[in-house]
């Protein structure tokens, strides 16, 4: 039960996180015009990964896309790449984790397969979250560097008395959305990895061997296994001891071609 809850919660947290990463990537407010200690402008500038916008005092907002690829700063390209990689990995992770959920039954998928898929999706979520956090942090670092550079030359002289005011940019809402979303995806991934440990069937130190007497159809199991009759189709071997509370369905093991000699 705890494993299912952990897995389900991990999935939900990751889903919210990835939705947040997608939202942050699409948002225009990665950097916003710094209004503190600046001349009061009748326009408000803000920029995203894909376009820059200007909101005029009348409320009219105009956005222009970055139609060049080669002309953009390498750092911006890197941030774009990190965010896209994060989204792609997260999306694949979500797809994998849907099939890995305990509450969803797909044919006769073994617990070991579900455990592997849970671990895979968990790792994908962790990497996705790290990509988003890294992307947002790189952009934030770029902003901080540019902020202090523009503060140093707040007013650049242009021939005598004429001055041009440099627009300073500060952290936009998308950065905080990205950080939180990346963190959630990371936490969700960790939860999936924890759930994977609980899903994986525990191996015993020795293989269970069945002996068939010529006259009776009785299987003898050494160690922690109860002997069961082999009549009918009931060939399941029930484990008596498992070190942890599990339902009967969770602990069933199906006979393989090596079980009987």
């Amino acid at each position: 039960m705890a494993v299912t809850a952990c897995q389900g919660l991990g999935f939900v947290v990751s889903l919210i996180g990835i939705a947040g990463i997608i939202a942050a990537t699409c948002m225009d407010q990665w950097s916003t015009q710094d209004l503190y200690n600046n001349p009061v402008t009748a326009v408000f500038n803000y920029q995203g990964l894909w376009r820059s916008c200007v909101r005029e005092s009348s409320g009219f907002t105009e956005c222009r896309g970055y139609f060049t690829l080669l002309g953009l700063p390498a750092m911006l390209q890197a941030v774009r790449a990190l965010m896209i990689v994060g989204i792609v990995l997260g999306a694949i992770g979500l797809l994998v984790s849907i099939f890995a959920l305990k509450c969803i039954r797909i044919g006769s998928m073994e617990d070991s397969a579900k455990a592997n898929m849970t671990l895979t999706s968990g790792i994908m979520f962790i990497v996705s979250g790290l990509c988003a956090i890294a992307g947002v942090s790189v952009f934030a670092n770029m902003l901080v560097t540019n902020f202090w550079m523009s503060t140093a030359n707040m007013y650049t002289g242009m021939g005598g008395m004429v001055q041009t005011v440099q627009t300073r940019y500060t952290f936009g809402a998308a950065l905080f959305v990205g950080w939180v979303a990346g963190g959630l995806t990371l936490i969700g991934g960790v939860m999936m990895c924890i759930a994977c440990r609980g899903l994986a069937p525990e191996e015993t130190n020795y293989k269970a061997v069945s002996y068939h007497a010529s006259g009776h159809s009785v299987a003898y199991k050494p160690g922690g296994f109860k002997a069961s009759t082999g009549f009918g189709s009931n060939t399941k071997n029930k484990k008596i001891y498992d070190g942890g509370a599990r339902t009967e369905d969770e602990v069933q093991s199906y006979p393989s071609k090596h079980d009987y000699v």
Epitope: A42, S52, C53, E56, S58, F60, Q163, T164, V165, T167
Partner: antibody
């Protein structure tokens, strides 16, 4: 047709108060920011104040801050300018003007103005 | 505050001739965010309120004749009346639309020679 009609001007003694009104019609008043601009007789234009469509933010020219207060009533399609502690140098024609949409913050429609004379 | 300096103070031009008015701002009116200039030109005829002619330094307001041409960028702007007509006799003002307080130039009076 967009129309802006100012009223409330007149002769007032120094130190007195006056409240100017601007009645707007022909457009959705609540969607537009509004300005007050004044012009002293025979002189140039001087911007006084701006109030956004939702009454915030509001901007004033520094020298009039504290004495002049701009407000609006979107339900009545009206703009107001409360002028206190009036001085002789406040004598001017006061215009209300609309902050145009998609015209780079320019003032696209102006009223005919109302004359305020501050004299003893 | 941004200081807007207009020149000349007055201008006498023959009908059909070109009239040129200059406007200089103390700070650049070019907004880096959209690379647009926030400068407007107004025409004021005697006894009338100002009328918007040009916004964004070069875009004509609807209904304004195409003989009115706005140009310039940053700190230096020009209003050109390519062929002066009798109805163009007025005072012309430039205005900073980027920084509060929004400031106007002193005005240029255009007359017929």
């Amino acid at each position: 047709e967009v129309q802006l009609v100012e009223s409330g001007g007149g002769l007032v003694q120094p130190g007195g108060s006056l409240r100017l009104s601007c009645a707007a019609s022909g457009f959705t008043f609540s969607s537009f920011g509004m300005h007050w601009v004044r012009q002293a007789p025979g002189k140039g234009l001087e911007w006084v104040a701006y109030i956004s469509s939702g009454s915030s933010p509001i901007y004033y020219v520094d020298k009039l801050k504290g004495r002049f207060t701009v407000s609006r009533d979107n339900a009545k399609n009206s703009l107001y300018l409360q002028m206190n502690s009036l001085r002789a140098e406040d004598t001017a024609v006061y215009y209300c003007a609309r902050a145009g949409y998609a015209v780079r913050n320019a003032l696209d429609y102006w009223g005919q103005g109302t004359l305020v004379t501050v004299s003893s | 505050d941004i200081v807007m300096t207009q020149s000349p103070d007055s201008l006498a031009v023959s009908l059909g001739e070109r009239a040129t008015i200059n406007c200089k701002s103390s700070q650049s009116l070019l907004n880096v965010g959209n690379q647009k200039n926030y400068l407007a030109w107004y025409q004021q005829k005697p006894g009338q309120p100002p009328k918007l002619l040009i916004y964004g330094a070069s875009t004509r307001e609807s209904g304004v004749p195409d003989r009115f041409i706005g140009s310039g960028s940053g700190t230096d702007f020009t209003l050109t009346i390519s062929s002066l007509q009798a109805e163009d006799v007025a005072v012309y003002f430039c205005q900073n639309d980027l920084f509060y307080p929004l400031t106007f130039g002193g005005g240029t009076k255009v007359e017929i020679k």
